[in-house]
Amino acid sequence: YDFTNCDFEKIKAAYLSTISKDLITYMSGTKSTEFNNTVSCSNRPHCLTEIQSLTFNPTAGCASLAKEMFAMKTKAALAIWCPGYSETQINATQAMKKRRKRKVTTNKCLEQVSQLQGLWRRFNRPLLKQQ
């Protein structure tokens, strides 16, 4: 999906109002310095591409993020403010359904959500030069 035509300011507002709080809740009890950010993005569409991938695609050691509260609200925001987004996700979601498990908060998942927090922070500061 090409995120170029999304309403970035509305997605940012939804992130600041609620998604960010859900990410913090997920990470509660974890030190903010515990994980190094290794995933980066260069502009808002790229950030949303990376956010979508980390949130919804199962990875080795962490298959459960797509069923978390922050994921549900992220999906809602992308569907509402990125034209055509919900239609493009049908095959991807159905392919993943069998692999998903609920509420297994592994260290790998915590690391992945830490990366997500970094991507969202970067998304919120689009004018910063890529480091």
Epitope: L16, T18, M72, S86, I90, T93
Partner: antibody, heavy 121, light 108 residues
Framework: QVQLQQSGAELVRPGSSVKISCKAS????????MNWVKQRPGQGLEWIGQ????????NYNGKFKGKATLTADKSSSTAYMQLSSLTSEDSAVYFC??????????????WGQGTSVTVSS | EIVLTQSPALMAASPGEKVTITCSVS???????LHWYQQKSETSPKPWIY???TLASGVPVRFSGSGSGTSYSLTISSMEAEDAATYYC?????????FGAGTKLELK
């Protein structure tokens, strides 16, 4: 304007199944989570689960897994809930409610009028 | 599962009286995830207060909401007849979504 129109009251036999509907209009049906909520007579509200019509993804309250099955038909902008193996405990009013961002806060912002299900022999 | 405990379960207030309904949450949640709904008999619930303190469209300004962490409240500064209803708090912080048992507010 956003509207959620639910199907009419149902009188069903114990052990049978029932499928109730919620027809949405006034918004992009595929892009919003649809929730279902149960209310027994004189009681409070209980969340059953939700479905994302765009891809059919569901989240259920564990208490209703095996009891409720949520589906959606994008072509008719209609969400469905099937209740199986009905008992008197399932006699209730069932609401559909859209999940949406209001002032960028996420909540159930529009509700259907409710469908009454009575289980009786 | 997050449990929401409302108090009182039932109360009566005279016109002009100040009313406070509380919602205690079993584990701390973000204030953005605590909502209130109003329900009158035989009708569907209506969104009333979003994210602890944001009034839904059309809600009179005599209503207000406050709280954080595990303690939230809905206040009516001056009770009016049309405020008689049942009020539910609800959390959207973790699955399963849960509601308080409700507070039935009657006119004295």
């Amino acid at each position: 304007q956003v509207q959620l129109q639910q199907s009419g009251a149902e009188l069903v036999r114990p052990g049978s199944s029932v499928k109730i509907s919620c027809k949405a209009s006034g918004y992009a049906f595929s892009s919003y989570w649809m929730n279902w909520v149960k209310q027994r007579p004189g009681q409070g509200l209980e969340w059953i689960g939700q479905i994302f019509p765009g891809d059919g993804e569901t989240n259920y309250n564990g208490k209703f897994k095996g009891k409720a099955t949520l589906t959606a038909d994008k072509s008719s902008s209609t969400a469905y809930m099937q209740l199986s193996s009905l008992t008197s405990e399932d006699s209730a009013v069932y609401f559909c409610a859209r999940g949406g961002y209001v002032n960028f806060l996420y909540a159930m912002d529009y509700w259907g009028q409710g469908t009454s299900v009575t289980v009786s022999s | 599962e997050i449990v929401l405990t409302q108090s009182p379960a039932l109360m009566a207030a005279s016109p002009g009286e100040k009313v406070t309904i509380t919602c205690s949450v079993s584990s701390s949640i973000s204030s953005s995830n605590l909502h209130w709904y109003q329900q009158k008999s035989e009708t569907s619930p209506k969104p009333w207060i979003y994210g602890t303190s944001t009034l839904a469209s059309g809600v009179p300004v005599r209503f207000s909401g406050s709280g954080s962490g595990t303690s939230y409240s809905l206040t009516i500064s001056s009770m009016e007849a049309e405020d008689a209803a049942t009020y539910y708090c609800q959390q959207w912080s973790s699955y399963p979504l849960t509601f308080g048992a409700g507070t039935k507010l009657e006119l004295k």
